[in-house]
């Protein structure tokens, strides 16, 4: 087994709106969560895009999910991630 | 380390309003965390109420209707319940209790408060 | 909402013993699962969150499973301070509900 890196980005989007995202690398094997949470509970799936879990050339995988969120409200904002049992939570950089 | 507090009137008459005070130590209520409010009745039945977060936005249980209102003062650092037209069926321990934006699970309780309501 | 049921409501078992409650969901909440303890007269207390993570300061004889809608809370040689009663609570989505209970009583 190898663990993910998690990291978490945010790019500009509409005024007033961010896109944060959230990228697992290097992980195997290929079964992993990736989703965001918002005030702790699970924010719906129809807000969020998931891309796929795509081998990165190193006999390990890699995927995202992303969201949109209004700008002034990452705190309110963790993507968590669960691998081989293990799993973590990590917050929107300010 | 952070410590809840809960206070309040053990009596209340049937169609007044209920009103709980949570004072906050060791952490500030506008820095991070969703402050929270939760019910056990008689017979141990746990009820989760609704919180104020940090930056203060309400969510409560939809169960509660329009009877619930959480607010707050962040010069004391206090957060309060006000529960109107209750009926016996609000006799409860009263808790708050805090939860981080990582999941909505409770790692911080106060002690309960039992408020009992009866003429 | 999401309902959470418990079993057994109660439960009686001797000291060592090992003992499991289990906490079924209406629906599938995707290990977002926390369970308490609770004594006579005190608040409840922290166990176990995101269905399998125990709770700073707690021993390791508590443990929890799960996945979908089914979750369980096994405790290994129960000891004499863990009798009261235990809850669990998603937080899948809001309203947070909890669990009726399950008192586990001295044999």
């Known amino acids: 087994t190898v663990p993910p890196m998690v990291n978490v980005t945010r790019s500009n989007a509409s005024e007033g709106n961010i896109t944060v995202t959230c990228r697992a690398s290097s992980f195997y094997p290929r079964n992993i969560i990736l989703t965001w949470r918002q005030d702790g509970v699970s924010l719906s799936h129809d807000t969020q895009q998931w891309g796929d879990v795509l081998p990165d050339g190193n006999g390990t995988y890699q995927t995202w999910v992303a969201t949109r969120i209004c700008r002034g409200e990452e705190q309110r904002f963790t993507c968590y991630m669960e691998h081989s049992g293990n799993h973590s939570t990590h917050p929107v950089p300010s | 380390d952070v410590q809840l507090q809960g206070s309040g009137p053990g009596l209340v008459k049937p169609s007044q309003s209920l009103s709980l005070t949570c004072s906050v130590t060791g952490y500030s209520i506008t820095n991070d965390y969703y402050w929270n409010w939760i019910r056990q009745f008689p017979g141990n039945k746990l009820e989760w109420m609704g919180f104020i977060s940090f930056g203060g936005s309400n969510n409560y249980n939809p169960s509660l209707k329009n009877r619930i209102s959480i607010t707050r003062d962040t010069s004391k650092n206090q957060f309060f319940l006000k529960l109107s037209s209750v009926t016996t069926e609000d006799t409860a321990t009263y808790y708050c209790?805090?939860?981080d934006g990582r999941g909505a699970w409770f790692a911080y309780w106060a002690q309960g408060t039992l408020v009992t309501v009866s003429a | 909402d999401i309902q959470m049921t418990q079993s057994p409501a109660s439960l009686s078992a001797s000291v060592g013993e090992t003992v499991t409650i289990t906490c079924r969901a209406s629906?599938?909440?995707?290990?977002?699962l926390a369970w308490y303890q609770q004594k006579q007269g005190k608040s409840p207390q922290l166990l176990v969150y995101d269905a399998i993570t125990l709770a700073d300061g707690v021993p390791s004889r508590f443990s929890g499973s799960g996945s979908g809608t089914q979750y369980s809370l096994k405790i290994n040689s129960l000891q004499p301070e863990d009798f009261g009663n235990y809850y669990c609570?998603?937080?899948?989505?809001?309203?947070?509900?909890f669990g009726a209970g399950t008192k586990v009583e001295i044999k």
């Open positions: 629906g599938n909440i995707h290990n977002y």
């Open positions: 209790a805090r939860y």
């Open positions: 609570q998603h937080f899948w989505s809001f309203p947070l509900t």
